[in-house]
């Protein structure tokens, strides 16, 4: 399929002109090869009219440019002083022969429709209303106003000034008077379709003394904006229908031949395809709502329409807006499992992609909400401090400058299956969806800390032990004090020289960390974890209690929380890499709603970085070791 | 703006006849409907009778059909109702509605713009 998109269906009537866009896939090589317009001919021959190398045909001199718009990934055509003559079938592509990669456009130029010499025109969109200016003689100010639809032989009425209306009119055509002016009288038309363009006829009085006037009503379909976008990125349909139906519920639907199958509402309807990877967001009293949809997939391409209605569904005759989504399978976004699975009691490891021209965007995890109009609270950014309820099972880890960064959730429970959302300040496209499963756990954890019950008293030497299994022994092995900015790393050595991993003893695999000696600041989470070069594996957590050498001395006692780190982890490694540089801390931004939002959240940032030193002062030590 | 003021209530004993009168004041040329509607004590709001101000054209509620007719005088800037064989029933407030546009529907009251203080009829049996 190729790459290279455009408008599938171009119109315009004689003398007027056309600017007809083509897109194609973001790289070097397409921003600097030869762009071409050409006409299809009957023997399936493409003719160059236009092209980027400066060929101009003879029948386009003077009245046709091409504009190449590389930081757009854009070609334009513009083509002045149509004639019917340039109805036909056209291409729009790239590369050194009309053999490239291209796209069919077909052009239609019309007549310019014969109207009688008096005629108004008025041109409206479908959905809109129309407001007919009626002129009289001031004779005729007493007599009855009317506005009649011109049918084959007849004059069909509309409405007239004694309340009588076409039925199909009732209820959206009204006759006015405006002021004091005596010489106009109007008739307002609302909720346009179709079937109400045509020749109409205002009339005041009666007889050949009656004042009359032509109106040529023109009801047009919104011409669908295009929109191109990389498989597995995000879009935005921003949509803007106006303060008439600020009130109304909104929908967003997608075109499947005759009908329009709505995706989602404000009225809570949603398209199960678009679950987990949808937000519809309104934005002001003025009728401005957008909808977001991220993971894009090959069929999500296609004709979409937004509108407003009551009903929450498409209704003729109310304003819409439409687009055509083109999906570029040549995607910049690298393809990572969109499904993740973990289990009760275990950890995941979660690699989401970023742009890497963006290695100090601001990174972000939230969890995608679908009640109401659905919504994605931010659990984790890079300058956002950990949601309270995920203390100590929640951490991000940026690595600048590789295009991933890595979300760690251990301590897993079945409520957090779910769908969640890797964003970031930066390119909007790089919004990712994760579907995160959690089954119960059906063996013992791959990784166990010892003691369970882990209570350190003050000034004395505290050690802790995590046992790992074989098979990973060759992955290194660590421990991090955890906090609401990150896990930071405590400084390792090894124990004892490496075995070969054939007499790898299933018993005695662990990796110690001593505190010593013991502070009050050493309260907290510790999580044991797994890593092979920047991928992050397994991980469990261990909630340390500080209490004073003298006993009966009160500390709160996580029973749970340390029951929950010791609970089965299944062996489910996600591809992702990690930075020992510390994360950023600001208060949460809240809930997410939009690319503004996020953006704002870069912008309150304040540059005060957690400490850089995961050895402590004051003679004290904190080290891991691996046996 | 247009304002609107009623006359001709009272007591009338069923059978009888009473005459009302709207007299029109302000930016009368935009009025394109002037109507009539009652309301009883504890009842809502109903439509009594309707005429256009460009084209005459007169409508009635099927209550008041044959008794009760409407009529303008475009000179003196007024819509009288005339009200024959009274009923009991007829006993409301009569309130005169004009509105600046015509549409079809003639006979819901939230379509009216413009609205009398009201006049008491009663009707002694």
């Known amino acids: 399929k190729s790459p290279i998109f455009g408008p599938q269906e171009v119109s315009s009537i004689e003398g007027d002109s056309v600017s007809i866009t083509c897109y194609y896939p973001d790289t070097s090589v397409n921003r600097h090869t030869r762009k071409y317009w050409c006409r299809q001919g009957a023997s399936g021959m493409c003719t160059t009219l236009i092209s980027s190398n400066g060929y101009l045909s003879k029948e386009y001199s003077g009245r046709a440019n091409l504009i190449n718009f590389p930081e757009n990934n854009t070609f334009v055509i513009n083509i002045e002083q149509l004639t019917q003559d340039d109805t036909g079938s056209y291409k729009c592509g790239l590369g050194t022969s009309n053999r490239g990669l291209s796209f069919d456009v077909s052009l239609e130029v019309s007549q310019v429709p014969e109207l009688p010499s008096d005629t108004h025109v008025y041109t409206k969109d479908i959905g809109r209303n129309v407001t007919i200016e009626c002129p009289f003689k001031r004779e005729n100010a007493p007599s009855k106003k009317s506005l009649c639809k011109k049918t084959n032989q007849s004059c069909e009425l509309v409405i007239d000034s004694t309340e009588k209306v076409n039925p199909s009119y009732i209820g959206r055509a009204k006759l006015f008077m405006k002021g004091t002016d005596l010489t106009v009288f109007y008739v307002n038309i609302s909720h346009l379709t179709h079937n109400d363009a045509g020749l109409y006829i205002c009339q005041a009085g009666e007889g050949p003394s009656a004042d009359k006037k032509n109106v040529d009503l023109q009801v047009l379909a919104p011409e669908p904006e295009l929109l191109y976008k990389d498989l597995r990125s995000s879009v935005t349909f921003e949509c803007d229908l106006g303060r008439e139906v600020a009130n109304e519920a909104k929908y967003l639907c997608r075109m499947n031949k005759e009908t329009c199958d709505v995706i989602i509402n404000t009225l809570g309807k949603r398209d199960p395809d678009f679950e987990g990877r949808i937000l519809i967001t309104p934005k002001d009293d003025n009728g401005r709502f957008s909808v977001l949809i991220t993971g894009l997939r090959k069929e999500d391409a296609g004709h979409y329409q937004c509108g407003a209605h009551s009903s929450g569904l498409p209704q003729e005759g109310w304003p819409i807006q439409t687009w055509q989504l083109f999906v570029n399978e040549e995607s910049t976004i690298p393809n990572r499992r969109s499904v993740v699975k973990g289990v009760t009691g275990g950890s995941v490891a979660i690699a989401c992609p970023y742009n890497p021209k963006e290695s100090s965007s601001l990174k972000y995890w939230c969890r995608w909400e679908g009640d109401g109009n659905g919504h994605c609270p931010v659990l984790v950014g890079t300058q956002a401090q950990v949601q309270e309820e995920y203390e100590g099972r929640l951490a991000l880890f940026d690595q600048p400058g590789n295009g991933t960064y890595t979300v760690i959730l251990n301590q897993l429970t079945t409520e957090d299956a779910g769908f969640y959302w890797c964003l970031t300040n930066g390119d909007s496209r790089w919004r990712t969806t994760i579907e995160l499963q959690v089954a119960e756990a059906t063996r013992e954890p791959n990784l166990e800390v010892t003691p369970q019950n882990a209570t350190a008293v003050l000034g004395e030497t505290f050690t802790v032990s995590c046992h790992y299994p074989c098979k990973f022994y060759s992955q290194e092995k660590y421990w991090c004090k955890w906090s609401n900015k990150g896990c930071h790393i405590l400084p390792s050595h090894d124990e004892g020289a490496r075995q070969s991993s054939v007499s790898c003893d299933q018993s005695s695999q662990l990796v110690s960390m001593t505190l010593n000696p013991v502070s009050k600041e050493d309260e907290g989470w510790y999580w044991c974890g797994v890593k092979q070069g920047q991928t992050y594996g397994e991980t469990t957590a261990i909630y340390i209690a500080v209490e004073e050498r003298t006993r009966g001395s009160s500390h709160v006692n996580p029973t749970d929380a340390n029951a929950r780190a010791k609970v089965a982890l299944e062996e489910e490694v996600v591809d992702s890499s990690i930075s020992e540089k510390e994360n950023k801390a600001i208060p949460n931004p809240g809930p997410f709603a939009n690319e503004r939002e996020i953006q704002n959240v870069g912008d309150q940032a304040q540059e005060n970085r957690a400490s850089g030193d995961a050895g402590s002062a004051d003679g004290q030590s904190r080290s891991s070791s691996s046996k | 703006q247009v304002q609107l003021v009623e006359s001709g209530g009272g007591l009338q004993q069923a059978g009888g006849s009473l005459r009302l009168s709207c007299a029109a004041s302000?930016?009368?040329?935009?009025?394109?409907?002037v109507g009539w509607f009652r309301q009883a004590p504890g009842k809502e709001r109903e439509f009594v009778a309707a005429?256009?101000?460009?084209?005459?054209?007169?409508y009635y509620a099927d209550s008041v059909k044959g008794r009760f007719t409407i009529s303008r005088d475009n000179a003196k800037n007024t819509v009288d109702l005339q009200m024959n064989s009274l009923k009991p029933e007829d006993a409301a407030v009569y309130y005169c509605?004009?509105?600046?546009?015509?549409?079809?529907?003639?006979?819901?009251?939230?379509?009216?713009?413009?609205w009398g203080q009201g006049t008491q009829v009663t009707v002694s049996s």
């Open positions: 005429i256009t101000m460009y084209g005459e054209r007169t």
């Open positions: 302000g930016r009368t040329v935009t009025v394109m409907t």
């Open positions: 509605a004009a509105r600046t546009y015509v549409s079809g529907i003639y006979d819901r009251f939230d379509d009216y713009n413009y």
